[in-house]
Amino acid sequence: YYFCYHHVTKLDEVAASQLTFPAVTLCNLNEFRFSQVSKNDLYHAGELLALLNNRYEIPDTQMADEKQLEILQDKANFRSFKPKPFNMREFYDRAGHDIRDMLLSCHFRGEACSAEDFKVVFTRYGKCYTFNSGQDGRPRLKTMKGGTGNGLEIMLDIQQDEYLPVWGETDETSFEAGIKVQIHSQDEPPFIDQLGFGVAPGFQTFVSCQEQRLIYLPSPWGTCNAVTMDSDFFDSYSITACRIDCETRYLVENCNCRMVHMPGDAPYCTPEQYKECADPALDFLVEKDQEYCVCEMPCNLTRYGKELSMVKIPSKASAKYLAKKFNKSEQYIGENILVLDIFFEVLNYETIEQKKAYE
């Protein structure tokens, strides 16, 4: 019994005069805007996006919207076309949804915010945006009260008219419409494809948060690792940073390239490499390989407990007003607009701490 290193877990609620607001990362579920896909993009990435077959032809499809098909047929006429250099990172950056077009309104603690308050970040969903990233010398925002008026409220247009037509199943095309959101500490990068939650158009979604500070014990009392980050890419250790680090190594090893959201200096994967290697290899790693990316728990971490609720937007009463305000049809408003409210439930944080049962 002397050699048993027991621990107990202490739970505490700590009142705070202010709390650091978390980073909020959001991604449109559509990776590339239809209007931004050029002839050259289509030539290089058309097969990856299931818009072309392997003979550079539009597949025989009965599912196509006539207007979109007409535009694509024109772009897919490659007679006498001379392909130009193509880079997936540049394609994601240029063709991804622009926060300046999506963001219809923004308020933090009642004060107006804007697209300038969102920092571009690349994830597996492509071009995404983080509010309150705490990077580029910007201070981390604080909140002094709980409740909806003391957090972030944004209204977004998800721009479904810009969604790529889906004529096949690929990792780069989505069956869904909406955004993915992750609420995370500024000390860890987003891992939104695995850890994000979905927010649908046609709804106002309320996310009530509670900050949780977790303190784990190292061996032999617990299993945490008081690691300093052994990484070329991230300053501080987190499970997320470790997993991104590991996924990057796995892809470079298997495919000799990296996806656009991965750090490092390996070349970006070409569309062909995405299709034949990077996408299936990463899917295999995430879904099947239980051993390659074993990331240890840090001894200190901050996470955010969340409770979600939703109401319909627009109401029948407001549909006409919103359509007029944003110069769109009522149908467009119903299919594209969402409101997201993120706030602290109360101004306290929870500590969950492992303590040695006896010294």
Epitope: Y250, P280, F284
Partner: antibody
């Protein structure tokens, strides 16, 4: 270039033992699970056994459970299949394969014949 | 264990024909399915992985589709070199299993 080379096959009597080896090169061996697959003469392909990258996890087809043992030596980039209590129905070409998003390439195999 | 049922077992066809081989899994296997071609005395040769991705160097007349439990291998226009035995394999979960094979013969 990824390469796998099987060896150790041969003629053995029923009830006898044999140890197959697979030498791997061209990839970070310890990062990948490995499997053995066999094919009896004129028959189809049958998965036999698999082992995780660290060697900590092993899996077997029901037909060989309790008789075959898979192991690996990551320092030598080798995977092994120890076959005991061999039966006539174990006669086959044995291939080793790297488990990943695609199982490619395969070695040329090593032939095991169990006969008295 | 997941059973893989391949059909037909034997298929007679002529050069230029369009050929479809199907593979049905007894449980959902997502898209973790591969197709192999094998010729007598040779090791299996990978054609398609993750249900629909064409292995590098494999002619584009081969294509794969399906997800979940139903999968197909299509050869759009049969060539003399394509007469061989074809196997599907699920690598979604242990025990990894193969279909019983489809022997493609000259009619």
């Amino acid at each position: 270039e990824v390469q796998l080379l099987e060896s150790g096959g041969g003629l053995v009597q029923p009830g006898g033992s044999l140890r197959l080896s697979c030498a791997a090169s061209g990839f970070t061996f310890s990062s990948f699970a490995m499997s053995w697959v066999r094919q009896a003469p004129g028959k189809g392909l049958e998965w036999v056994s698999g082992i995780s990258g660290s060697g900590g996890g092993t899996h077997y087809a029901d037909s060989v459970k309790g008789r075959f043992t898979i192991s690996r030596d990551n320092s030598k980039n080798m995977v092994y299949l120890q076959m005991n209590s061999l039966r006539a129905e174990d006669t086959a070409a044995y291939y080793c394969a790297k488990e990943a998003y695609k199982w490619q390439p395969w070695g040329q195999g090593t032939l095991v014949t169990v006969s008295s | 264990d997941i059973q893989m049922t391949q059909s037909p077992s034997t298929l007679s066809a002529s050069v230029g024909d369009r050929v479809i081989i199907t593979c049905r899994a007894s449980q959902r296997i997502s898209s973790w399915l591969a197709w192999y071609q094998q010729k007598p005395g040779k090791a299996p040769n990978l054609l398609i992985y993750k249900a629909s991705i064409l292995e590098s160097g494999v002619p584009s007349r081969f294509s794969g589709s399906g997800s979940g439990t139903e999968f197909t291998l299509t050869i759009s226009s049969l060539q003399p070199d394509d007469f061989a035995t074809y196997y599907c394999q699920q690598y979604n979960s242990y025990s990894y299993t193969f279909g019983q094979g489809t022997k493609l013969e000259i009619k």
